[in-house]
């Protein structure tokens, strides 16, 4: 039932959060490296949702490093100048331009691994990341539209007669709130400067036999259900209807 809240809100969450830092990657393993990549995928763009506070690894096209001339990572983040990280194989030199975020780095030495990693993804890492590989056979691109996901904080409470409020605070993107059973509901969204959204759904149940109401919050990071028993109308010793 959850801990008793002062307002009798019963916090019941569908998922117990795992606080260990997770890592996500869209990389292919070496077996998938193909010589005829040029014929199949000269340029690939991927939309990639990544949970905030996880680690992310972004990969270049699956081109064998021995065929490489230059690798360039181009990083375009909102409100910042374009950052580039380049590696020139011939001289074994790396160069950075306008790159200030120390959490965005090569996974290891670029002559061994061309992948880019973001350690502890933050909202500010929303943006476009592109790897450009220059080879004797031409240029190959792989781009990522990285969408940072922020899990909303969910609360449920009763604020007046047979009216409950469910809030999904500071989620990215906006969460969707539904109720069991359906009530007379109004939903508002509040947009924050950091790109997160707070969704507030207020519902009233006129039907007197509704005992427990459930708020279901759907979000790309996972779903949560909370429920609460509706309190009696003040002054009512008995319900209007006996069952």
């Amino acid at each position: 039932e959850g801990a008793a809240q002062p307002n009798n809100s019963l916090m019941l969450q569908t998922s117990k959060e795992n606080h260990a830092l997770a890592s996500s990657s869209l990389c292919m393993d070496e077996k998938q490296i193909t010589q005829n990549y040029s014929k199949v995928l000269a340029e690939v763009n991927t939309s990639w949702p990544v949970k905030m506070a996880t680690n992310a690894v972004l990969c270049c096209p699956p081109i064998a490093l021995r065929n490489l001339i230059i690798i360039t990572w181009e990083i375009i983040l909102r409100g910042q100048p374009s950052c580039t990280k380049a590696y020139k194989k011939e001289t074994n030199e790396t160069k950075e331009t306008n790159c200030t975020d120390e959490r965005i780095t090569w996974v290891s030495r670029p002559d061994q691994n061309s992948d880019l990693q973001i350690r502890t993804v933050a909202i500010t890492h929303d943006g476009y990341y592109r790897c450009i590989m220059v080879t004797p056979d031409g240029n190959f691109h792989r781009g990522y539209h990285l969408q940072v996901l922020v899990t909303p904080e969910v609360t449920l409470f009763q604020n007046r007669n047979r009216t409950a409020v469910c809030k999904a605070v500071a989620g990215k993107p906006a969460a969707h709130i539904s109720w069991i059973p359906e009530g007379d509901c109004a939903t508002k969204q509040e947009y924050w400067s950091n790109g997160t959204v707070t969704v507030k759904s207020t519902c009233h149940w006129e039907v007197h036999n509704v005992s427990t109401v459930t708020c279901h919050v759907s979000h790309l990071t996972g779903n949560k259900s909370l429920y609460i028993e509706l309190l009696p109308v003040p002054g009512a010793k008995k319900s209007a209807k006996l069952y």
Epitope: N8, I180, P181, S211, L231
Partner: antibody
Framework: QVQLVQSGAEVKKPGASVKVSCKAS????????MHWVRQAPGQGLEWMGN????????NYDEKFKSRVTMTTDTSTSTAYMELRSLRSDDTAVYYC???????WGQGTLVTVSS | DIQMTQSPSSLSASVGDRVTITCQAS??????LNWYQQKPGKAPKLLIY???NLEDGVPSRFSGSGSGTDFTLTISSLQPEDFATYYC?????????FGQGTKVEIK
């Protein structure tokens, strides 16, 4: 931790009344509904009604409403269920359950026999 | 009142078996559902709340699924201590209504 401790077994004659108690601890008694559920021997579970200790508001199942009264004593955090005009088919284990059904009392066996 | 139709009413199974119990609500209205385990002489014990959430301390071999009006309790690998009677309960509307129960017996 939340605990619901019920009164002991009772043997009653047909036509008599029984009052079962349920003493709550480990939470704010006045903030949660208390439900009463019964189970006849070898049968399923049957909801009887509930009471909100914060206001005394009650809901009774149609089947029991003429014979049951649910009350609370907030000073001792105790809920009571009184069933009148007992019949042999009222022989059952009576349970109290808090809120949304996570916590239950151990049950009270009420035997109605002549 | 919401009627809860639970099936099967009884089943025989062996240790290690996968067991599935279903519960369906009448009237086509969405409900919030709990699953309980009851052993002889004991009070019902909450296993699953809000259809698919495992109560603290309950082994992970128990799981709940479903939404709206159709729900399922699954025991992935039956253990000796799991032989008992299982009930579903809808708590959205008054009166609370229970399924008829499913007795899980040793084969």
């Amino acid at each position: 931790q939340v605990q619901l401790v019920q009164s002991g077994a009772e043997v009653k004659k047909p036509g008599a009344s029984v009052k079962v108690s349920c003493k709550a601890s480990g939470y704010t008694f006045t903030s949660y509904w208390m439900h009463w559920v019964r189970q006849a021997p070898g049968q399923g579970l049957e909801w009887m009604g509930n009471i909100y200790p914060g206001s005394g508001s009650t809901n009774y199942d149609e089947k029991f409403k003429s014979r049951v009264t649910m009350t609370t004593d907030t000073s001792t955090s105790t809920a009571y269920m009184e069933l009148r005009s007992l019949r042999s088919d009222d022989t059952a284990v009576y349970y109290c359950a808090r809120g949304t059904g996570a916590y239950w009392g151990q049950g009270t066996l009420v035997t109605v026999s002549s | 009142d919401i009627q809860m139709t639970q099936s099967p009413s009884s089943l025989s199974a062996s240790v290690g078996d996968r067991v599935t119990i279903t519960c369906q609500a009448s009237q086509g209205t969405s409900i919030n559902l709990n699953w309980y385990q009851q052993k002889p002489g004991k009070a019902p014990k909450l296993l699953i709340y809000s259809a698919n959430n495992l109560e603290d301390g309950v082994p992970s071999r128990f799981s709940g699924s479903g939404s709206g009006t159709d729900f399922t309790l699954t025991i992935s690998s039956l253990q000796p201590e799991d032989f008992a009677t299982y009930y579903c309960l809808q708590i959205t509307y008054l009166p609370w209504t229970f399924g008829q129960g499913t007795k899980v017996e040793i084969k």
